[in-house]
């Protein structure tokens, strides 16, 4: 190997990455045109740009089929651009019905072939972008990697574009001869690298001697409200669940100019920024009348960037609830349902590119996630305090109100991209 | 993939009533919320009704009192009991999932005879 490559600055040419396997659509979904009707932002990767809206293709397909099998009541929060980047590094070693279901699940199908052939050099590029602003009031640290079994022998190439785009080598363990202690292996590992953020990502006995390969990616986001709330103004009060009970929130409060808009059936979204402007919070919040459910059912990327493109800044007041959410789950199951069965199966598995033996009875035996993020007076995440001089509540009757004291959605995106980082809904902020 | 089987439509007098299963091979079935819709000749497809994993429905103002929505795990099954059926009730009827869609499956023809 020569001198290490940086890929936030490489061009393609400078590292081969061509997958084992590519895919064509036979439907020929994607053109090298499309998205043009769109207007790139400035010095924006076109194929950056493609990918980013594949994403939030599978972003708001995901969302909708996870909180399907959810409780109307449960929180929920993931961040759909880590799953999707780590399936992507199974897409790199993936042929047959494994690469196509990838493709079609994921939206990958959707953009041109030259975007899609070279993805995890664009995903590299994505992620540069994301992980690497130059402004230090944010931090975004995930972890995701593969975990396989220690009786394989894994694919060189394989194992070094993984290291130089997704940060991290396929990693052995002894899950035959030792499943717990390679779980508190990858544990411990999650913890780590999300400095303690992010624990216990892989429950109990969800590793035995049988497991293949584990797929792991968790994530969290810890930022500063370029307008934060003052502690002094924040009230106890009640949070309308969806089933109809009450609960006792800490509603955070403060009057600023914001970009908001009231779109269809009076559905108020409001956009708070975080300090450095390029990551916002958004939040979707449908009329007392109308069940977020009801939100969730008809949100769709077209919906949801129509939205976005509608705000307008302007005076308003903002009551919003502290929260923390922690949400892990098994991808397993969703995905399988939504179409992606190969790759999970013993028998119909296709991942030769990830061995070096060229075997064909490697599966994915489980994909986990976790997310979380924390929502206070300064930011997301706890952050050290600093005096905030902010006038108190003022009784202004004319003043557009947003009160989010019943369910909503959240969204925390990269504004220049419209990247969906994170996505969930707050239904009980009152749970610790 | 999900594959979504209804079946129990058939003819019926105004007034009567008929019961629509939908078997679903959904992993993620027990905890998935599930809704019957009906598309009628020339309209848009409609929600008729859905009930979530917890067991709670919800249904659309024309079918209130008259449709029950229920469902058991144990066979992976929806059913959707249809009780006073009007003339307007003639439809394709069709299950899936609430927000998220699977592939349409075929549906079960609903006809009323006058």
């Known amino acids: 190997h020569g001198s290490p490559v940086d890929i936030c600055t490489a061009k393609p040419r400078d590292i081969p990455m061509n997958p084992m396997c590519i895919y064509r659509s036979p439907e020929k979904k994607a053109t090298e045109d499309e998205g043009s009707e769109q207007k790139i932002p400035e010095a924006t990767n076109r194929r950056v740009w493609e990918l980013s809206k594949a994403n939030s293709r599978f972003a708001t397909t995901f969302y909708q089929h996870l909180a399907d099998s959810k409780n109307d009541n449960d929180n929920i929060f993931l961040s759909p651009l880590s799953i999707s980047t780590a399936f992507a590094m199974t897409k790199l070693g993936a042929c047959n019905d494994t690469l196509q279901q990838l493709m079609e699940v994921f939206k990958f199908d959707t953009i041109s072939e030259k975007t899609s052939d070279q993805i995890h050099f664009f995903f590299a590029k994505l992620n540069c972008r994301l992980y690497r602003k130059a402004n230090k009031s944010s931090k975004l640290v995930s972890a995701n990697r593969l975990f396989g079994d220690k009786s394989l022998t894994f694919n060189e190439t394989y194992q070094d574009i993984s290291e130089l785009v997704y940060g991290a080598k396929l990693q052995p363990l002894d899950f035959k001869e030792n499943a717990e202690q390679s779980r508190a292996a990858i544990n411990k590992w999650v913890s780590n690298k999300t400095e303690g953020r992010i624990t216990d990502v892989i429950p109990s006995e969800a590793i035995n001697e049988l497991t293949v390969l584990v797929l792991v990616n968790t994530i969290y986001f810890k930022g500063l409200w370029k307008s934060k709330f003052s502690p002094e103004n924040t009230r106890k009060e009640l949070f309308y669940k969806a089933d109809g009970e009450s609960c006792s929130a800490s509603m955070m409060y403060q009057e600023g100019k914001f970009r908001y808009r009231r779109v269809a059936e009076g559905t108020q979204v409001l956009e708070l920024p975080f300090k450095g402007d390029d990551i916002t919070m958004v939040l979707i919040l449908p009329k007392p009348e109308k069940s977020l459910a009801k939100v969730e059912k008809e949100l769709t990327p077209e919906v949801l960037q129509e939205w976005l493109d509608e705000l307008e800044e302007m005076m308003l007041v903002v009551h919003m609830p502290r929260f923390r959410i922690e949400d892990g789950f098994s991808l397993k199951e969703q995905l399988q349902d939504m179409g992606l069965v190969d790759l999970f199966s013993p028998e119909k598995s296709k991942l030769p590119g990830i061995v070096a033996e060229g075997r064909d009875d490697l599966y994915v035996s489980d994909a986990f996630h976790k997310a979380f993020l924390e929502v206070n007076e300064e930011g997301s995440e706890a952050a050290a305090s600093t005096a905030v001089v902010i006038a108190g509540r003022s009784l202004n009757p004319n003043r557009v109100t947003f009160k989010a004291n019943r369910p909503f959605l959240v969204f925390i995106r990269e504004v220049p991209l419209n990247t969906i980082i994170f996505m969930g809904r707050v239904a009980n902020p009152c749970v610790k | 993939q999900v594959q979504l089987q209804e079946s129990g439509g058939g003819l019926v007098q105004p007034g009567g009533s008929l019961r629509l299963s939908c078997a679903a091979s959904a992993l993620t079935f027990s905890s998935r919320a599930w809704a019957w819709y009906r598309q009628a000749p020339g309209k848009q497809r409609e929600l008729v009704a859905s009930i979530t994993g917890g067991g709670t429905t919800n249904y659309a103002d024309s079918v209130k009192g008259r449709f029950t929505i229920s469902r058991d795990n144990a066979k992976n099954t929806v059913y959707l009991q249809m009780n006073s059926l009007k003339p307007e009730d003639t439809a394709v009827h069709y299950c899936?999932?609430?927000?998220?869609?699977?592939?349409w499956g075929q549906g079960t023809q609903v006809t009323q005879v006058t």
């Open positions: 899936n999932g609430y927000r998220y869609t699977y592939a």
